[in-house]
């Protein structure tokens, strides 16, 4: 074999409807290019159940499987699945042959292949078709929400899927509202979850050849009524130079719909507080949590007058929470001068 020669399935067109089961022997160091479907509708290539990325030394790209230089770890089972389905278009095993340096130059490269189109589909143990969609293993959802677990798989014969909860068969008969099992989507759906739905959910995918399983852990958060929670340390004390831009950040967590305001503390008639004991404030920004970037207060081209105390105030039907920070503004001409913020620079308070 010449070093430049590639192992290639010709032509690079859509395969016949019958699945191609093939075994190819590839010399170490040899480039490989295998095709599956027309370029614009090419299938997705998987190695041992993991989808190949479109970039890298071994890549699946526009229906092509490309290996720059075949290495021992590249040997194994490769599958091409039709886009948008789990139909196996190509099913082949790459086997490591001799390295190019020791290969027999008289050998016909085609003798490395078994391209017979078998009419009987080969049996295959179940495997995950989209493991990247199963990456989120730990789920925590508020009570009343809908939960959907998916375990997309394939195999031959087509596997069956069943679900366990905490190791026991789970059909949802004891669950108010039951469950929805969508076998064609390999999914379990539970609507309006409650604390008793907490547990370990296992999908068990089986066929005559083998079985695989995957666990999801579910926690259900009880909607205990509470005022908004503000992330500690935000907004943060900030120092800026005259003319610069400043961003103050406030992170709000709330089950009930929260309402957020940004306030600046001001002085009226020489006093910071009114007769009622509350501070004088100016409302700079107000909105609900769904508004774009309401949790950020932008101050453009700051001047000395912008220095002072700023408060993020969040309220819901249960109560109010607020945290404050100080903005210190330094003059451009004398960067050595610093305005000292009060000792207790960052406050956080809760009001019922």
């Amino acid at each position: 074999l010449e070093a430049s020669e590639e192992v290639e399935l010709e032509p690079c067109l859509a395969p016949s409807l019958e699945q191609q089961e093939q075994e190819l022997t590839v010399a170490l160091g040899q480039p490989v290019r295998l095709c599956c479907g027309r370029a614009e509708r090419g299938g997705h290539w998987y190695k041992e159940g993991s989808r190949l990325a479109p970039a890298g030394r071994v890549r699946g790209w526009r229906g092509r499987l490309e290996i720059a230089s075949f290495l021992p770890e590249d040997a194994g089972r490769y599958l091409c699945l039709a886009r948008g389905s789990m139909i196996v278009l190509q099913n082949l095993t790459l086997i490591t042959g001799d390295s190019l340096t020791s290969s027999n130059d008289d050998e016909d490269p085609k003798s490395h292949r078994d391209l017979s189109n078998r009419h009987s589909y080969p049996q295959q143990a179940p495997y995950w078709t989209h493991p990247q969609r199963m990456e989120k293993k730990l789920h925590a959802v508020p009570a009343g929400n809908t939960v959907k677990f998916r375990c997309p798989a394939a195999g031959n014969p087509t596997p069956t899927i069943r679900w366990l909860k905490d190791g026991q068969a789970f059909h949802g008969e004891n669950r108010i509202g039951g469950i929805r099992l969508r076998h064609q989507h390999w999914s379990l759906v539970m609507e309006s979850v409650v604390p008793s739905d907490r547990g370990t959910y296992t999908c068990l995918v089986e066929n005559a050849v083998g079985s695989i399983r995957y666990n999801y852990l579910l926690d259900v958060l009880e909607r205990s009524p509470h005022r908004p929670i503000l992330q500690a340390g935000l907004p943060a004390n900030t120092t800026a130079v005259v003319g610069s831009d400043v961003e103050l950040l406030c992170k709000v967590y709330s089950d009930a719909q929260p309402h957020i305001q940004w306030l600046k503390h001001i002085v009226i008639n020489g006093s910071s507080f009114g007769a009622d004991g509350f501070p004088y404030v100016q409302v700079l920004k107000t909105a609900d949590i769904n508004s774009s970037e309401v949790e950020v207060l932008y101050l453009r081209n700051v001047s000395a007058e912008d220095a002072g105390e700023y408060t993020c105030l969040a309220g819901n039907s249960i109560g109010l929470s607020y945290q404050s920070a100080w903005l210190t503004v330094l003059p451009e001409e004398d960067p050595t001068w610093t305005a000292a913020a009060p000792e207790a620079a960052s406050h956080h308070h809760h009001h019922h």
Partner: antibody, heavy 119, light 112 residues
Framework: EVQLLESGGGLVQPGGSLRLSCAAS????????MAWVRQAPGKGLEWVSV????????VYADSVKGRFTISRDNSKNTLYLQMNSLRAEDTAVYYC????????????WGQGTLVTVSS | QSVLTQPPSASGTPGQGVTISCSGS????????VNWYQQLPGAAPKLLIY???LRPSGVPARFSGSKSGTSASLAISGLRSEDEADYYC????????????FGGGTKLTVLG
């Protein structure tokens, strides 16, 4: 800045009990899964237990099941590990770790607290 | 006996590259992503690689991870003396219970 600070370790006799604490700061504790991982002297890491944000969902390693209890107090931003019926093989540095909510790895670890079980 | 198998030791000289392997089974690495942790002498473990091949911010590009089937590997290029540490692979395991399994750890020595 995310910080996890374990405490409560010490010397205890076989059969005794100990309660470890992990004070969390710099993140919204009540929204994260948390875990305990231990490391016996000169040995590798061993996962001990995991707990959901509500505190109502817990999982344990077989080696501690029935003896250890993981819990949390979200109002105090604190994770706990109650260890009962302690054995010599429980001697280890115990780390608390935050679990990343996206891909379920331990993204932040505490500095650890040493538990020694010996008579 | 760790569920994931790692070589107990590895070594290299400064500037060299080294690869640490981690072998598992279909119930752990085969079904779940692999994470790598670095433990410097006397310190707590620190996340090095997550989701097979992703680096947290602050981890140099010299560290890279990969996974194929039921095995994973951590590659370190351009070795530096500060890379001398224990390295652990980990993954969730979907056996009869859900739990996390670790490799036994690989002690990396940077020679000279």
């Amino acid at each position: 800045e995310v910080q996890l600070l374990e405490s409560g370790g010490g010397l205890v006799q076989p059969g005794g009990s100990l309660r470890l604490s992990c004070a969390a700061s710099g993140f919204t504790f009540s929204t994260y899964w948390m875990a305990w991982v231990r490391q016996a002297p000169g040995k590798g890491l061993e996962w001990v237990s995991v707990i959901g944000p509500s505190g109502g969902m817990t999982v344990y390693a077989d080696s501690v099941k029935g003896r250890f209890t993981i819990s949390r107090d979200n109002s105090k931003n604190t994770l706990y590990l109650q260890m009962n019926s302690l054995r010599a093989e429980d001697t280890a540095v115990y780390y608390c770790a935050r679990i990343n909510s996206g891909s379920s790895h331990f993204d932040y670890w505490g500095q650890g607290t040493l538990v020694t079980v010996s008579s | 006996q760790s569920v994931l198998t790692q070589p107990p030791s590895a070594s290299g000289t400064p500037g060299q590259g080294v690869t640490i392997s981690c072998s598992g089974s279909s119930s752990n690495i085969g079904s779940n992503s692999v994470n790598w942790y670095q433990q410097l002498p006397g310190a707590a473990p620190k996340l090095l690689i997550y989701s097979n091949n992703l680096r947290p911010s602050g981890v140099p590009a010299r560290f890279s991870g990969s996974k194929s089937g039921t095995s994973a590997s951590l590659a370190i290029s351009g070795l530096r003396s500060e890379d001398e540490a224990d390295y652990y692979c980990a993954a969730w395991d979907d056996g009869l219970d859900a739990y996390v399994v670790f490799g036994g750890g690989t002690k990396l020595t940077v020679l000279g």
